[in-house]
């Protein structure tokens, strides 16, 4: 959320964020690294335009203007220099002036060899257990946020993995209203709306970053998971990858995975929602995972199929009003599953990225708590890549994506709940190899996709 | 002054392990990633892993994997190279050397001087 | 796991002269690729960061240069002192494997 730099009575006080690159006389002598010409401490620039009237409590709400609640002034970097405090380049550039293009290379976890595989469990586990080098998380609300004693920030060190649940769960939690009030819930920054692509692109992109720095590893990628397959099971649910299904329990990972230790943080929902507090780094149970085990729901208990994807790609407008979940003919929508896969609106369809969540049946199809599995990770590198196809075969025509009135958190201009430093969607509304510095090693089925006899 | 000083020469047995040792000083091991490579006698260099002794998190080289074993003591400055199951083509001279932690500078820019492990019954 | 080329394996030249040594790695690395001098039985010693950087102390003889998958060390108006081993290394992804080295002899 923040920078562990700018968690301090002076900076939450002062309302700025702008930490020193390199500071040879002293604190506040090279704020965004002004010394080198990287960037500048500059007032932060948030989205004021209106938001769709679903969203009632304006006022009440951290996440509302993000991030003046907290912060007025941040870094603002020249050219290709990025980061907290400007020392690091945009993605896909690097070197001592950020000059110099790369490109990393996103693959199917299924094609990868064995010691790719892994090398790639292994580096989320150690995600899992390393504290963000960066970021710290806040566990109160902005008007608790310096403690009992108005002199003790409320803030924690969180795993570089936890962190990138806390995040998810940030940007979909209810918005607190009071003790004894029930706490709103009709509102999600980066669900159920344009925002929905670019908001977990960037999330992404993120984790991605932190974990090439964890092991130094600049070629380092997330690779996805191609759930388009029509099965009714989870191809990438064995030891060697994402855990394979416990035989003394069916609703645990065996005990073989990794991922069999890991424990969930963000399940506390119910204190958050009557007491007010934050998710801490707090862990507690279990993953849960059932894939296609919901008896209840048969639509669920199978994943989507491949011409379901070749499907949403035709489907030309990025977005449709109401913007929402509701929206007909929205390539986000249909993508995001609230849409059939040609773009129909249908309140009783789960398609594609919702599909692919529901299926898993556990801890991965709950939406405060879905990164915890972190099939998530790849369950979303996929998703991206469907969005990638998309802005490479419509030019990124961002036309479609509203300037105002979207749901809260969703306008064009809004900066994305709750990533430091401020970044918009229109940011991460741009084809990924020619911007960001990745790109997928995919081929996509063709509408008249069939099963050889 | 940067410097790592590493433990003196090792002669062991086959089968046995042996832990050396590098002591650092003129900078504070938190701030680095400390690696370790091997040269075998008259041959090239070869990467063995690295630690990061702020977390003591590690990363090795596959044919590492399993003989190999780093470990860091931040009170003391000091960062460890265990290795088992020796055999003669263990012999070899090991390296300590440290990376900017900012993982964007591509370069070991301090090396210990060595230490001689010999394998042999 | 990216492989790397070191070429010539060992070459010999005169005081003075202009020699390269070259590494191919087996993928795109860009830039991340480090080259360093050993003396006989003394530690590898850092030359050259980011393919063309050089390390601080390091005469201005020495140059790096290249991309993608081609890199080269130049050494000009060569000295005596010059002799030794060359590695180069990448740091592009996991393993950070070593080039075999080239043999320098000063004539």
């Known amino acids: 959320q923040f920078p562990r730099q700018c968690a301090t009575v002076e900076a939450l006080r002062s309302g700025m964020c702008c930490p020193d690159l390199s500071p040879v006389s002293g604190p506040g002598t090279d704020r965004c690294g002004s010394s080198s010409g990287r960037g500048r401490c500059e007032a932060v620039t948030a989205d004021s335009r209106p938001h769709s009237p679903q969203y009632p409590h304006d006022g009440r709400d951290d996440r509302e203007v993000w991030p003046l609640r907290f912060f007025n002034r941040t870094c603002h970097c020249n050219g290709n220099f990025s980061g907290h405090n400007c020392g690091t380049c945009r993605p896909g550039w690097r070197g001592a002036a950020c000059d110099q293009r790369v490109l990393i290379v996103r693959r199917n976890l299924l094609d990868l060899s064995k010691e790719e595989k892994n090398h790639f469990v292994r580096a989320l586990d150690m995600a899992k257990r390393t504290t963000h080098p960066l970021f710290v998380i806040a566990t109160r609300r902005s008007e608790e946020i310096l403690g009992p004693d108005g002199n003790t920030p409320q803030f924690e060190n969180i795993s570089i993995y936890n962190y990138f649940v806390w995040t998810h769960y940030y940007s979909v939690k209810k918005t607190f209203l009071g003790v004894g009030q029930e706490s709103f819930g009709e509102v999600d920054f980066s669900h159920e709306g344009p925002a929905f692509l670019t908001w977990h692109r960037y999330h992404l992109l993120r984790l991605e970053k932190d974990m090439q720095e964890m092991l130094q590893e600049p070629s380092f990628s997330l690779p996805y998971w191609n759930f388009a397959t029509g099965k009714n099971v989870c191809d990438i649910c064995t030891d060697d990858l994402m855990g394979s299904r416990s035989n003394f329990d069916s609703t645990l990972i065996s005990p073989n995975s990794v991922f069999s230790q890991w424990r969930v943080v963000c399940d506390s929902l119910e204190d958050y929602d009557t007491l007010g507090t934050l998710c801490n780094s707090t862990e507690d149970g279990p993953i849960r995972r059932n894939p296609a085990g919901n008896v209840a729901r048969p639509m669920v208990q199978r994943l989507p199929e491949p011409q379901d994807v070749a499907q949403c790609l035709e489907v030309g407008l990025f977005d449709t009003p109401p913007f929402y979940s509701n929206s007909t003919n929205s390539f986000r929508n249909t993508v995001e599953g609230y849409s059939d896969p040609t773009g129909k609106y249908d309140p009783a369809v789960r398609s594609l990225h919702n599909l692919a969540h529901l299926f898993l049946n556990g801890t991965g199809g709950q939406t405060h708590l879905s990164p915890n599995d972190p099939i998530f990770v790849l369950l979303h590198t996929f998703t991206d890549a469907v969005f990638d196809e998309w802005l490479r075969r419509y030019n990124a025509d961002i036309s479609t994506f509203p300037l105002e009135n979207a749901p809260i958190g969703h306008n064009r201009q809004y900066n994305m709940v709750p990533f430091w430093p401020p970044v918009t969607n229109t940011e991460m509304f741009v084809t990924a190899p020619d911007n960001l510095g990745y790109t997928y090693e995919i081929q996509w089925p063709s509408r008249e996709f069939s099963v050889p006899e | 002054e940067v410097q790592l000083q590493q433990s003196g020469a090792e002669l062991v047995r086959p089968g046995a392990l042996v832990k050396l040792s590098c002591k650092t000083s003129?900078?504070?091991?938190?701030?680095?990633?400390l690696h370790w490579v091997r040269q075998r006698p008259d041959q090239g260099l070869e990467w063995i892993g690295w630690?990061?002794?702020?977390?003591?998190?590690?990363v090795y080289d596959p044919k590492f994997q399993g003989t190999a074993s780093l470990t860091a003591d931040t009170s003391s400055n000091t960062v460890y190279l265990q290795l088992s199951g020796l055999t003669s083509e263990d012999t070899a001279v090991y390296f300590c050397?440290?990376?900017?932690?900012?993982?964007?500078?591509?370069?070991?820019?301090?090396w210990g001087q060595g230490t001689t492990v010999t394998v042999s019954s | 796991d990216i492989q790397m080329s070191q070429s010539p394996a060992s070459l010999s030249a005169s005081v003075g002269e202009t020699v390269t040594i070259t590494c191919r790695a087996s993928?795109?690395?860009?830039?991340?690729l480090a080259w360093y001098q050993q003396k006989q039985g003394k530690s590898p010693h850092l030359l050259v960061y980011?393919?063309?950087t050089l390390a601080d102390g390091v005469p201005s003889r020495f140059s790096g240069s290249g991309s993608g998958t081609q890199y080269s060390l130049k050494i000009s108006s060569l000295q005596t002192e010059d002799s030794g081993n060359y590695y180069c290394?990448?740091?592009?992804?996991?393993?950070?494997?070593f080039g075999s080295g080239t043999k320098l002899e000063i004539k």
């Open positions: 630690i990061n002794p702020d977390n003591g998190n590690t």
């Open positions: 993928g795109n690395i860009y830039n991340y």
């Open positions: 290394q990448h740091f592009w992804s996991l393993p950070f494997t």
């Open positions: 980011d393919a063309k």
């Open positions: 050397t440290r990376r900017d932690y900012t993982y964007e500078k591509a370069a070991l820019d301090y």
């Open positions: 003129g900078f504070n091991i938190k701030d680095y990633f």
